[in-house]
Amino acid sequence: SGVTCADGPCFNGGLCVGGADPDSAYICHCPPGFQGSNCEKRVDRCSLQPCRNGGLCLDLGHALRCRCRAGFAGPRCEHDLDDCAGRACANGGTCVEGGGAHRCSCALGFGGRDCRERADPCAARPCAHGGRCYAHFSGLVCACAPGYMGARCEFPVHPDGASALPAAPPGLRPGDPQR
């Protein structure tokens, strides 16, 4: 056909190289995203299904954009928001799935998204009837005001020395040893 590199046959920024044999006067080396003997065809990059987990692929020209289905995130929708396997909860916390997201259920004394924040177990004022709360490595301890007892100072101590403990479980009389 007589076309040479001097005629500028390569489109879309393709690099023209003179052909090595008489049958091809030139060869176009195409930039990413283009193909064809003259780099005239745009490669359908979305046809390669680059977006994971059923994400919608948009070819912006200069880049791709993935729009993710519910429950997935990331540039390629590669992160499963419901997947506890990809979630590390620190300080003995456990991962809980559901609701399109996953969260950490933190061990006593810890809080925050990944259980990395130290929580004050006394912040909720757990000690009743004016008891004083002390944070302890294993949780909290209540120092009860006079006249109260129990782990949370919830039971009043009667003047005769008896305490108003909760009723005995069914089948047990007060005073019976609990098995």
């Epitope: 990413p32 995203g33 490669v43 990059r45 390669l48 680059p50 994400g55 919608l56 948009l58 070819d59 912006l60 020209g61 200069h62 880049a63 791709l64 954009r65 993935c66 729009r67 993710c68 289905r69 519910a70 997935f72 995130a73 990331g74 540039p75 390629r76 928001l81 399109g100 997201a101």
Partner: antibody, heavy 128, light 112 residues
Framework: QEQLVESGGGLVQPGASLTLTCKAS????????MCWVRQAPGKGPEWIAC???????AYSASWAKGRFTVSKTSSTAVTLQVTGLTAADTATYFC??????????????????????WGPGTLVTVSS | DIVMTQTPASVEAAVGGTVTIKCQAS??????LAWYQQKPGQPPKLLMH???VLTSGVPSRFSGSGYGTEFTLTISDLECADAATYYC??????????????FGGGTEVVVK
């Protein structure tokens, strides 16, 4: 530490032109788009334009085409040229980074669709 | 181009309370929504992207939900430091081949 700093703002006459500069430090300019967003007093942010650093591709809001031109001037700086300024262009102009992500063997970079780093802004006041 | 509509324009709540901000997109944007916090004299700060993914360092009191066209930002256990204006934002790609970004009108959060 990652930082963007805008400069070039000030008081300008209606009809004048202006060039704003955004300098980046503390991060690799590549695999990011550098964008311009403006905010008129008491209003919400309004996206103007971006330039993708890897190949220089620029894209802008339809209303900004013609009067606003974004360019990459060095490996750490981008500019926004504005012509035909009017009082309606009075705003704080922010430079913002929109990250792109690359994966080995992937056919392209992937746009994130958000802005994860902003400069403090430069105020442009158009008044006679 | 896409239009992002935020409600309410302003909301007031007490310290320790909860605030809910809604953002509606004029078309299906899947999960492509970001939330920003802006205080006077400062640039917007990214709180969340992909509708529900918190940015590093943002407290878990902030949470996001929604998909398609309806999205919500919830701030629980309100603190005085949460007093700010909050914006939603998405990106769009039109059939004409133009790519860009759109912001909501903003919601001012007043903490009593």
């Amino acid at each position: 530490q990652e930082q963007l700093v805008e400069s070039g703002g000030g008081l300008v006459q209606p009809g004048a032109s202006l060039t704003l500069t955004c300098k980046a430090s503390g991060f690799d300019f590549t695999s990011n788009a550098m964008c311009w967003v403006r905010q008129a007093p008491g209003k919400g942010p309004e996206w103007i334009a971006c330039i993708y650093n890897d190949d220089g591709s620029a894209y802008s809001a339809s209303w900004a085409k013609g009067r606003f031109t974004v360019s990459k001037t060095s490996s750490t700086a981008v500019t926004l040229q504005v012509t035909g300024l009017t009082a309606a262009d009075t705003a704080t102009y922010f430079c913002a980074r929109s990250p792109y992500y690359t994966y080995g063997g992937a056919p392209s970079a992937y746009a994130s669709g958000y802005f994860n780093l902003w400069g403090p802004g430069t105020l442009v006041t158009v008044s006679s | 181009d896409i239009v992002m509509t935020q409600t309410p324009a302003s909301v007031e709540a007490a310290v320790g309370g909860t605030v809910t901000i809604k953002c509606q997109a004029s078309e299906n944007i899947y999960n492509s929504l970001a939330w920003y916090q802006q205080k006077p004299g400062q640039p917007p700060k990214l709180l969340m992207h992909d509708a529900s993914v918190l940015t590093s360092g943002v407290p878990s009191r902030f949470s996001g939900s929604g998909y398609g066209t309806e999205f919500t930002l919830t701030i629980s256990d309100l603190e005085c430091a949460d007093a700010a204006t909050y914006y939603c934002q998405s990106d769009y790609y039109s059939t004409g081949g133009s790519y860009g970004f759109a912001f909501g009108g903003g919601t001012e959060v007043v903490v009593k």
